[in-house]
Interface confidence: low
């Protein structure tokens, strides 16, 4: 029912109610007299300066004379209403003041209002390599001779042939030669939809330019490539064999969601399948530094360990909601989860045998594995005070680091040591 | 040869509405962006609103916002613009242009006029 | 919203000419900039992209330059058919947003 409310819904305060939550509703207050009839009622929804606010009305009927309902904003004018604007309004530059006014000596008449608010566009991306395993490592660590990501995804695809082992490219049959422009897309290969084997090699490229200057995210929410098939993405727009590999996906992803950052506003992505392949290829989105899909909820300020730094660096999914994984940097993906008390996480994912399990910050990234599954210590952008943090994202006690012992699963605590501590 | 061919336009009443077309042809339509750019008689050019590949995103300029939809048809490869409460400074010739951002064909435009 | 602010509004030149305008972001905007042609009664064609890069089919006696906030298109010998207003064109911010156009004319 599209009135029905499924979001956090603040009735009037004094003082203001301030609204921490991305989404959520308001409405009038209840009123039986006019001694219970609030004459002002504020809220306060919070965000940052890059932020618009989206307000939908469900119902907006004051009573114009002695009921007001402003909206207040740091880059538009005040907004005056008493009756429902054609279309949602979109409040740009953080916080929202609403403020219902009411100047009637009796219950007001109106029959009052409902809406609706949401925060959108806020991300920025990390300077980062996402691994197969879905652990982040930095993009300078990419085809340096290390594995970082602890699976060697991030040293796959470095050779300087750009297309090992693959035939010549003919021209496709299907249009797939494709420059997208938007801030953020979809885009499929073109046997995705309709599943079609092809007698002869088919080679695509999609240019990702927004023309703007910031980093993309390209996402690959389906892969299903054929033996033999592979994805390339190139960071820069091209051709190919000019532009530094970001990775390369062959049918070894096929079933993985794996997210790809540029080091650069634009980016190619090269599919190429051999004759008669058996695989429907790739669904894939993008979207610059600063956007986050329509679908997808903005990461932001949190409760969890490093709330306050690298604020809004990700979105996540519907689907990365609750999961277990910290997909935000400050656990935003992973707050106010069913079946955990406020302020605590999941171990795992809802519905998951883990799921039960709770912890609370302190117990995140402190060396001391509180989940059955490890949940607690992975993917560690920080580490509690007192502890180490590994190139690949787990942490162990400080005074382990340089003892001649590795202890990080990568041996990072052994690395850049100046001196040898002495043995205790 | 790219082509694009913007119809639907003419004189509506202040408050009324149109419905504009682009039929493209030349280039694969669904690997486009495509926007709706106006000029008002003597003015400038100015954005109207822009629709990725698969319909969305649609973006729109405040002064259209809530009053105009932009939308595509990738089957027939047409674009479309329907104006809804027509205002006299909605007055111009409208083009309908290829991609997104970096406009590299544009129809010869259809102009609407908003008078009563 | 980022303002395009051209400079100047129109000119007069005769054929042969070096002719610059100029166009300023009211933020910087990198190297993303369009330029346009348009004749009267004409729908506008596209020029230059990325303040620098020449469409394709565009004679050469067209260039442009700048990044930032300050950007030039220059006309090094100007033609009797480049007489026409000129836009510039900012595409990494919606509303995508344009200069108020420059009328080049004849002496």
């Known amino acids: 029912h599209p009135d029905r409310i499924i979001f956090p819904n603040h009735a009037c305060e004094d003082p203001p109610a301030v609204l921490l939550e991305v989404q959520g509703t308001l409405q009038r207050p209840l009123v039986r007299d006019s001694r219970t009839s609030p004459a002002n009622c504020t809220w306060l929804i919070l965000g940052s300066k890059e932020q618009t606010v989206t307000i939908r009305f469900q119902k907006l009927h004051l009573a114009c004379g002695s009921e007001r309902l402003t909206l207040r904003s740091p880059l538009q004018p005040l907004i005056s209403l008493c009756e429902a604007p054609p279309s949602p309004l979109q409040l740009p530059g953080g916080n929202v003041t609403i403020t219902y006014s009411y100047a009637g000596a009796r219950a007001p008449m109106g029959q009052g209002f409902l809406l609706s608010y949401s925060q959108d566009w806020l991300m920025c991306l990390q300077e980062e390599f996402q691994c197969l395993n879905h652990r982040c490592v930095s993009a300078v660590q990419r085809c340096d001779g290390v594995d970082a990501c602890g699976d060697g995804s991030d040293e796959a695809g470095c050779s300087s042939d750009p297309f090992p082992g693959l035939t010549p490219r003919p021209v496709p049959s299907l249009p797939c030669n494709v420059t997208l422009e938007d801030f953020y897309g979809v885009f499929s290969s073109p046997g995705y939809t309709h599943l079609a084997s092809v007698s002869h090699p088919q080679s695509c490229h999609w240019l990702l330019d927004p023309h703007d200057g910031r980093r993309l995210a390209v996402r690959f929410t389906a892969l299903d490539l054929g033996f033999g098939d592979a994805v390339h993405v190139y960071d820069g727009p091209g051709p190919p064999e000019s532009s530094r590999l970001l990775r390369s996906l062959t049918h070894f992803s096929n079933g993985k969601a794996v997210t790809v950052e540029t080091l650069s506003g634009q980016a190619v992505v090269s599919y190429h399948t051999v004759a008669w392949s058996n695989g429907r290829g790739f669904n894939a989105t993008y979207h610059v530094r600063g956007y986050c899909l329509p679908w997808d909820r903005p990461c932001g300020l949190g409760s969890g360990l490093g709330a306050g730094e690298g604020l809004g660096e990700r979105c996540y999914s519907e689907a990365q909601r609750c999961d277990g994984s910290w997909d935000c940097a400050d656990g935003t993906d992973e707050e106010d989860c069913p079946g955990c008390p406020p302020g605590h996480f999941p171990c795992g994912a809802a519905g998951t045998s883990g799921a039960t399990a709770c912890y609370l910050p302190a117990d995140r990234c402190n060396y001391q594995t509180f989940c059955a599954d490890g949940a607690d210590e992975r993917r560690c952008r920080h580490c509690q005070p007192g502890n180490f943090r590994c190139r690949d994202e787990k942490c162990v006690y400080e005074t382990w680091v340089c003892d001649g012992q590795p202890d990080c699963a990568d041996g990072s605590d052994e690395w850049d040591c100046s001196y040898v501590l002495p043995r205790k | 040869e790219v082509q694009l061919l913007e119809s639907g336009g003419g004189l509506v009443q202040p408050g009324g509405s149109l419905r504009l077309s682009c039929a493209a042809s030349?280039?694969?339509?669904?690997?486009?962006?495509m926007s709706w750019v106006r000029q008002a008689p003597g003015k400038g050019l100015e954005w109207v609103s822009q629709?990725?590949?698969?319909?969305?995103?649609?973006t729109y300029a405040d002064s259209v916002k809530g009053r105009f939809t932009i939308s595509r048809d990738n089957s027939k490869n047409t674009l479309y613009l329907q104006m809804n409460s027509l205002r006299a400074e909605d007055t111009a010739v409208y083009y309908c242009?290829?991609?997104?951002?970096?406009?590299?064909?544009w129809g010869q435009g259809t102009l609407v006029t908003v008078s009563s | 919203d980022i303002q395009m602010t051209q400079s100047p509004s129109s000119l007069s030149a005769s054929v042969g000419d070096r002719v610059t305008i100029t166009c300023r972001a009211s933020?910087?905007?990198?190297?993303?900039l369009n330029w346009y042609q348009q004749k009267p009664g004409k729908a506008p064609k596209l020029l230059i992209y990325?303040?620098?890069r020449l469409q394709s089919g565009v004679p050469s006696r067209f260039s442009g330059s700048g990044s930032g906030t300050d950007f030039t298109l220059t006309i090094s010998s100007l033609q009797p058919e480049d007489f026409a207003t000129y836009y510039c064109?900012?595409?990494?911010?919606?509303?995508?947003?344009f200069g108020q156009g420059t009328k080049v004319e004849i002496k």
């Open positions: 990325r303040a620098s």
């Open positions: 242009a290829k991609s997104g951002k970096k406009f590299d064909y």
């Open positions: 030349g280039f694969t339509f669904s690997s486009y962006a």
């Open positions: 933020q910087s905007i990198s190297s993303y």
């Open positions: 064109q900012q595409p990494t911010s919606l509303p995508l947003t």
């Open positions: 629709i990725g590949t698969m319909g969305r995103p649609t």
